[in-house]
């Protein structure tokens, strides 16, 4: 018979014949022959392969380096890699989370629009007229100025984006 030019799914072509790929979690030890099946071996501790493959070496599990602010989010198996995430208060500096940096704080005059997560940084926004923030914070929103009127007081000092209004008693007309 004619040697195959293409093989079925989960097979590969070698020496003019189709051999079975190794299943996820296993690596190739030897190709099949006319008389023998493909020989595969399970990946060792701290190794994995996540696809049907003909790899002769398993991949090393990713190391979540604490020096880079990383910790293990999900432990790897023979078929999956370790997933790293950032320590509390830190966020990833790239899509694959290769390292972490501290969440940004919003300076006075700015409030938190969106609190940081493990993968995205704090989003700050300037406090609009009528609101203020007098602290540098990673979670405080802009606060509304105090309403002097509701306390039967008057504004003695106008508010800014960094300071609240100062209320005081209304001047009484002398008799």
């Amino acid at each position: 018979p004619e040697p195959p030019t293409a093989c079925r799914e989960k097979q590969y072509l070698i020496n003019s014949q189709c051999c079975s790929l190794c299943q996820p979690g296993q690596k190739l030890v030897s190709d099949c022959t006319e008389f023998t099946e493909t020989e595969c071996l399970p990946c060792g501790e701290s190794e994995f392969l996540d696809t049907w493959n003909r790899e002769t070496h398993c991949h090393q599990h990713k190391y979540c380096d604490p020096n880079l602010g990383l910790r293990v989010q999900q432990k790897g198996t023979s078929e999956t890699d370790t997933i790293c995430t950032c320590e509390e208060g830190w966020h990833c500096t790239s899509e694959a989370c290769e390292s972490c940096v501290l969440h940004r704080s919003c300076s006075p005059g700015f409030g938190v629009k969106q609190i940081a997560t493990g993968v995205s940084d704090t989003i700050c926004e300037p406090c609009p007229v009528g609101f203020f923030s007098n602290v540098s914070s990673a979670f405080e929103k802009c606060h509304p100025w105090t309403s002097c009127e509701t306390k039967d007081l008057v504004v003695q000092q106008a508010g800014t984006n960094k300071t609240d209004v100062v209320c005081g008693p209304q001047d009484r007309l002398r008799a």
């Epitope: 990713k62 880079l68 890699d81 500096t93 940096v101």
Partner: antibody, heavy 112, light 112 residues
Framework: VRESEGGLVKPTDTLTLTCTVS????????MSWVRQAPGNGLEWIGA???????YYASWAKSRSTITRNTNLNTVTLKMSSLTAADTATYFC?????????WGQGTLVTVSS | DIVLTQTPSPVSGAVGGTVTIKCQAS??????LAWYQQKPGQPPKLLIF???NLASGVSSRFKGSGSGTEFTLTISDLECADAATYYC??????????FGNGFGGGTEVVVK
Amino acid sequence: VRESEGGLVKPTDTLTLTCTVSGFSLSSYDMSWVRQAPGNGLEWIGAIGGAGGTYYASWAKSRSTITRNTNLNTVTLKMSSLTAADTATYFCARGWTRLDLWGQGTLVTVSS
Amino acid sequence: DIVLTQTPSPVSGAVGGTVTIKCQASEDISSNLAWYQQKPGQPPKLLIFPASNLASGVSSRFKGSGSGTEFTLTISDLECADAATYYCQGGYWTSTSNFGNGFGGGTEVVVK
């Protein structure tokens, strides 16, 4: 990490370079392309993230495409509309701002 | 794109001495900065990331410091083998549309 052979490319042509990796999964790491013109410094071209997102330097965005094949463990850079200014050694490296594994680089010469 | 400005270049120092290289980022990149050493005909080698953390197998004679926009690489007890070009690289990433990455222009270190 190993880049395919570069060589001589004509102006206006498209460059295709392939980077083959082993020992780690492309689904778990970002991969960057960096180039270096003769006698010059390093220049970041772009990257493909562990989840598959693509990122380009502003100068490269309009004429570069980075793709990957996680089954074949390959990352490919295509760059169109080449000029003599694109003559450089092109490196493939693992990471984003922590490029801890580099290929040896491949020299691409753009000339007619 | 992030612009990283390295100074000075070149810089020279005597064997056993100390040299300092500065890197200034155009925007706040927190501690997300790497330092690389490159010798002629070789790919760059990661020395430090992030900002002050020594990469595996790198001599403690190399010291990184700084955060935000100002960073420094100090090489003490200079050896002839330290003669090379040094690059800083910095960036940030929060989403596929909010990112930046770039290299400094490089600083050549001459050891006398």
